[in-house]
């Protein structure tokens, strides 16, 4: 079965309630021309920031062609939730759906999109739109990865030794130093899926007076610098 290219566009806007909102839909320029009548699974990995709003889209098929629209939601440690709309009877049905933040954007007969209001870590999972037509099913799947921005701190704890921490990020942040030193990195995993990364570096060379900790993360990058003092210096802290 022909499948669309998974090149995507991520649109970000501001909602009235000041939450960033992102909508992931197919980039129209990337759709394969010869679309088969029955589509194999089309899946997309989608990173989305925690506390934003997310909108997930179905394939572009007009309601007049459809029999049933179903959203299947599989979240870690929970039974599969399904939200279905049957066109013939104009009725919606939900099975095992407990999260009130996951809803249809509007009436399914007007808009088949699914929205997640104020994305939380618990929304990590797989979301699939299934459009049932008389001649087969069209699928659009999303592996939703919730991103959590780590809190970054940098401080000196011993003579010519600095500690850079990226606390409670998801996924784990990557820490690098300028200039490079003699470093040890540890990761601490939390039950909610976040990770704290701690990098401790020592510089023996005495002409190194200022060091920079660079934290790379999917939500953005952050650099902090500190002067190496003979005694521990002031603590620096920042959000990405």
């Amino acid at each position: 079965a022909a499948q669309p290219n998974n090149s995507l566009m991520l649109q970000t806007s501001k909602e009235n309630h000041a939450l960033a909102s992102s909508s992931l839909c197919m980039d129209e320029k990337q759709i394969t021309q010869n679309y088969s009548k029955v589509l194999a699974e089309v899946n997309t990995s989608w990173p989305v920031k925690m506390a934003t709003n997310a909108v997930l889209c179905c394939p572009p098929i007009a309601l007049r062609n459809l029999i049933i629209i179903t959203w299947e939601i599989i979240l870690r440690g929970q039974p599969s939730c399904t939200k279905a709309y049957k066109k013939e009877t104009n009725e919606t049905k939900e099975t095992n759906c407990t999260d009130e933040r996951i809803t249809w954007v509007s009436r399914p007969d007007q808009n088949s999109d699914l929205q997640i209001r104020t994305v939380a870590i618990t929304h990590d999972g797989y979301y699939r739109c299934i459009m049932v037509t008389p001649d087969g099913n069209f699928h659009r799947g999303y592996h939703l990865q919730v991103l959590v921005t780590p809190e970054v701190t940098l401080f000196q704890n011993r003579n010519r030794t600095a500690v850079c921490k990226a606390v409670a990020g998801k996924p784990a942040a990557h820490i690098s130093w300028i200039p490079e030193g003699d470093c040890a990195t540890k990761q601490e995993y939390w039950s909610n899926g976040t990770v704290t990364v701690k990098s401790t570096c020592h510089w023996e060379v005495h002409n190194v007076s200022t060091v920079t900790c660079h934290v790379s993360h999917l939500t953005g990058n952050k650099s902090l610098y500190i002067e190496l003092l003979p005694v521990p210096g002031a603590k620096k802290s920042a959000k990405l």
């Epitope: 889209c57 008389p134 001649d135």
Partner: antibody, heavy 119, light 110 residues
Framework: EVQLVESGGGVVQPGGSLRLSCAAS????????MHWVRQAPGKGLEWIGY????????NYNEKFKGRATLSSDKSKNTAYLQMNSLRAEDTAVYYC????????????WGQGTLVTVSS | DIQMTQSPSSLSASVGDRVTITCRAS??????????MHWYQQKPGKAPKLLIY???NLESGVPSRFSGSGSGTDFTLTISSLQPEDFATYYC????????FGQGTKVEIK
């Protein structure tokens, strides 16, 4: 190969009616929405309405409501357009076109049939 | 109903010219990241032929000199280098709700 063939065109008297046929082949007839469009001589395309043979769901351009009726015969794989109270301005080539699912685009059209309303 | 305004209604061009036709909808024809706007070519005595669907996707078998762009209410069909067989009438069409065609643009030989 998908094919749509219209028939039933010809000369009709003002006030009369027409019944056009669109015979479909090369696909499962009940699976796709069929649209009807007309084009007056030297004019643009005008959407009349559609029928979904799967469930006989129909929808019409407001202009043709009450005067046009769409139907289908699943056993014959044929869609029909019936139009009543014909006027000279209904003189046109009438087309049927199949809507594809993805993008709701019209990938297949019939060749058209000419209806002339004249006394 | 959504009204479609196509411009120009006609244009004269030469082989090799770049031709641009625009279509404006009275309200947005985009939803869920897709624009339900299509472009068709029609030659005298023939049925229309699909060129572009969902605003910017080239239908299979259509030459790459044809391209479409736009979203929301404003759309464009571009022929990068006009060929002799491209002299025809072009229509935009939306299929989001009830369907409407633009009034057509006739591309004639200069």
């Amino acid at each position: 190969e998908v094919q749509l063939v219209e028939s039933g065109g010809g000369v009709v008297q003002p006030g009369g009616s027409l019944r056009l046929s669109c015979a479909a082949s090369g696909y499962t007839f009940t699976s796709y929405v069929m649209h009807w469009v007309r084009q007056a001589p030297g004019k643009g395309l005008e959407w009349i309405g559609y029928i979904n043979p799967y469930n006989d769901d129909t929808n019409y351009n407001e202009k043709f409501k009450g005067r046009a009726t769409l139907s289908s015969d699943k056993s014959k794989n044929t869609a029909y357009l019936q139009m009543n109270s014909l006027r000279a301005e209904d003189t046109a080539v009438y087309y049927c076109a199949r809507e594809d699912y993805y993008g709701s685009r019209w990938g297949y059209w019939g060749q058209g049939t000419l209806v002339t309303v004249s006394s | 109903d959504i009204q479609m305004t196509q411009s120009p209604s006609s244009l004269s061009a030469s082989v090799g010219d770049r031709v641009t036709i625009t279509c404006r909808a009275s309200k947005s024809v985009s939803t869920s990241g897709y624009s339900y706007m299509h472009w068709y070519q029609q030659k005298p005595g023939k049925a229309p032929k699909l060129l572009i669907y969902l605003a910017s996707n080239l239908e299979s078998g259509v030459p790459s000199r044809f391209s479409g762009s736009g979203s929301g209410t404003d759309f464009t069909l571009t022929i990068s280098s006009l060929q002799p067989e491209d002299f025809a009438t072009y229509y935009c069409q939306h299929s989001r709700e009830l369907l409407t065609f633009g009034q057509g643009t006739k591309v004639e030989i200069k």
